[in-house]
């Protein structure tokens, strides 16, 4: 038998420095977690203790803090090289700055293979990107070889900016021939490493013949066997075992997100490359693990450029600003309310006596809210904090839509509710009631909108044929997160101001904020 140790991360989202327990900015260093310096300590410890070790990343290193805002991916290449990652799969966020923003800082600089079997380049891009990412890579590990085959969410064109010259194929359809090729080449230990979410990870384990292990990302899934060490609630045991269609037991793993844990999986293979056993658990990278001094010094060196960028206080919050995915992708969250209020405030234009304002409504995809802000830092809010909440560098735009389009959008918001997907809408100037016991496409049972042609604003039922103005992120206006109906049916689209600037201006204007959860989004069951 031959034993392999797989160390893995996913959805690190620019958390190069240690963070607080909820993955926002580190306030009390003695209680902080993660960061590349601490990760390196643990990785090196395991490399010294065990013979056959692979360090893998399942995508979405890009996007999430000021590090990415300033360094645009150069920081990812530099520190992943320093940690000596063995391979990485492309995530959807690796395309946030377009293909060029992936090629120049990362693909050309990485000293490790970057993988995706289901992304195919066409047109002029094909020759430009050739060899810079691979469908698979065979790696030497001790006296053996291991094949790593990559995959990326086929939803990427809806979630990021890959452009028109990359085709995202079905993961299973694309993976099978590559795995078959590896088998033909007598590579009998194969890891699928990718970024399509836990459900797809499990499907790959079930359907792709020849895959021995699946290391995933995208859904921030936390798996754990035994008593979990922090706040994350396990979605299942680690590893999660899937019985494949050809009768094999295939371990599937993921390691939450934000560099808080290091996935640790030990696999035992027989001489024919079959998995005999698998066990492990994510390792919580808490303050009991020291930060590596050399990596930490390098972080501090790179940090200087960031410190000049955005550390002045904009205003204060006296409440916790809940921007967690656990809240904002499932229910009304006060961070969503704050952002929507800022978006409306930024568009106050009293140009007609008949209207208190020309627009009263805001919608905001919950997946676009990327971090909470803790009020226990003297209440201070900085540009840097906001860059972690709204890291995508988008704009808040003005559109005109028919009521019927808005109704479709709100149905889409909850069509697959419960899977922590980003399309769940946060709102302003809208009261919506969902009944999740009804079938998808028929779950919106009440949709009231704030009048504009009125002296005392009040909520009236949405009219299907009426045209409404709505403020929303450009991401939604462009059909992101599956909101194709907005892109296809909008009657007018005017580009707006930078998202972080809109919120920072609002906070500066208000000086002290205290947004609440106030019943904008409700759930009910039964007759209406």
């Amino acid at each position: 038998a031959w034993e392999l140790t797989i160390l893995h991360t996913n959805d690190v989202h620019s958390r190069l420095e240690q963070t607080s327990e909820d993955s926002s900015k580190c306030v009390n260093a003695s209680r902080c977690m993660g960061g590349v310096a601490r990760l390196f300590t643990k990785v090196q410890q395991i490399r010294r203790a065990e013979p056959n070790v692979l360090l893998l990343d399942a995508g979405d290193q890009y996007q999430g803090t000021i590090w990415f805002t300033v360094y645009k991916g150069a920081e990812v290449a530099h520190f992943m090289n320093a940690l000596r990652y063995d391979a990485m799969a492309l995530g959807n966020h690796e395309f946030d700055n377009g293909v060029e923003g992936l090629i120049e800082p990362l693909l050309k600089e990485a000293k490790f293979p970057i993988l995706s079997a289901n992304i195919k380049a066409k047109g002029p891009l094909a020759s430009q990107i050739s060899g810079l990412y691979l469908p698979y890579k065979v790696l030497p590990v001790g006296d053996e070889v291991v094949g790593i085959v990559g995959y990326t969410s086929k939803e990427t064109p809806f979630l990021s900016n890959p452009g028109t010259n990359l085709v995202f194929e079905d993961e299973i359809t694309a993976l099978q021939p590559e795995v078959d090729k590896l088998k033909t080449l007598n590579v009998n230990k194969i890891i699928a490493l990718g970024h399509s979410g836990f459900e797809m990870d499990k499907l790959i384990a079930q359907k792709v013949r020849g895959v021995d292990v699946v290391v995933g990302g995208h859904s921030n899934t936390f798996l754990y066997t035994g008593n979990p060490p922090s706040k994350e609630v396990p979605a299942g045991k680690y590893p999660f075992i899937v019985t494949s269609d050809d009768g094999r037991k295939v371990p599937v793993v993921q390691a939450y997100a934000f560099g808080k844990y290091l996935g640790y999986l030990k696999i035992e293979f027989d001489e024919r490359g079959n998995v005999i056993s698998s066990h492990g658990n994510p390792i919580l990278l808490n303050s009991s693990i020291p930060e590596d001094p050399s990596i930490k010094a390098d972080i501090n060196k790179w940090r200087i450029k960031l410190d000049n960028y955005s550390t002045q206080e904009l205003g204060k919050t006296i409440v916790y600003l809940d921007g967690s995915s656990q809240s904002c992708r499932f229910r009304e969250c006060n961070m969503g309310n704050l952002i929507c209020d800022a978006m409306i405030n930024n568009n106050l234009r009293h140009t007609d006596e008949m209207f208190w304002n020309h627009v009263s409504m805001c919608i905001l995809n919950g997946g676009g809210i990327r971090s909470p802000i803790d009020e226990r830092n003297n209440g201070t809010i900085t540009w840097e904090n906001l860059a972690a909440v709204l890291p995508f560098g988008g704009t808040f735009d003005l559109v005109q839509l028919k009521g019927s389009t808005l109704k479709k959008a709100f149905e889409h918001s909850v069509h697959r509710y419960g899977q922590s997907t980003g399309e769940f809408l946060q709102v302003g100037g809208i009261h919506v009631v969902y009944d999740l016991s009804r079938k998808p496409g028929d779950r919106v049972v009440k949709l009231d909108v704030l009048c504009t042609k009125c002296r005392v604003p009040s909520y009236d039922p949405l009219k299907m044929d009426e045209v409404y103005k709505v403020i929303l992120p450009n991401f939604l206006a462009n059909g992101g997160d599956g909101f194709q109906m907005i892109k296809d049916e909008l009657l007018r689209h005017d580009s707006g101001d930078q998202d972080i600037n809109v919120v920072s201006t609002y906070i500066s204007k208000m000086k002290v904020i205290y947004p609440a959860v106030e019943g904008r989004i409700k759930f009910s069951t039964g007759s209406h």
Epitope: D86, K111, F112, P113, S130, G131, L134, P135, Y136, K137, V138, L139, P140, V145, L182, T184, L185, N186, V187
Partner: nanobody, 128 residues
Framework: QRQLVESGGGLVQPGGSLRLSCAAS????????IGWFRQAPGKEREGVSC????????YYADSVKGRFTISRDNAKNTVYLQMNSLKPEDTAVYFC?????????????????????WGQGTQVTVST
């Protein structure tokens, strides 16, 4: 068992020629990118020349361009390195390496990424 076996090394005078062979057993070389690497005493291993399996594209290090030629005979499952106009600085142990991954010949030769299969090497000495 997969093996790469180099042969053809030896002692040669400056300006002379040698032809190195890399024979594979246990796998078909036509599916692999193959590279010749060398390591001189006290120096790092460097890529000399690489050839792909599919389109037979080639790559040469600047130091050997115009003097060395890489070729492959898939029927014999062998890759060759014809070395002409040899110089004393070509003295090194020459290794053959193979990668079934679809890496470019340049990425293989640099090498950008770890290469899975290596031979034991053959000594080439260029001296009067």
């Amino acid at each position: 068992q997969r093996q790469l076996v180099e042969s053809g090394g030896g002692l040669v005078q400056p300006g002379g020629s040698l032809r190195l062979s890399c024979a594979a057993s246990g796998f078909l070389l036509d599916y692999y990118v193959i590279g010749w690497f060398r390591q001189a005493p006290g120096k790092e291993r460097e890529g000399v020349s690489c050839i792909s399996g599919s389109d037979r594209s080639t790559y040469y290090a600047d130091s050997v361009k115009g003097r060395f030629t890489i070729s492959r005979d898939n029927a014999k499952n062998t890759v060759y390195l014809q070395m002409n106009s040899l110089k004393p600085e070509d003295t090194a142990v020459y290794f053959c390496a193979a990668d079934p991954s679809p890496v470019t010949v340049q990425a293989m030769c640099l090498p950008r990424f770890p290469v899975p299969y290596w031979g034991q090497g053959t000594q080439v000495t260029v001296s009067t």
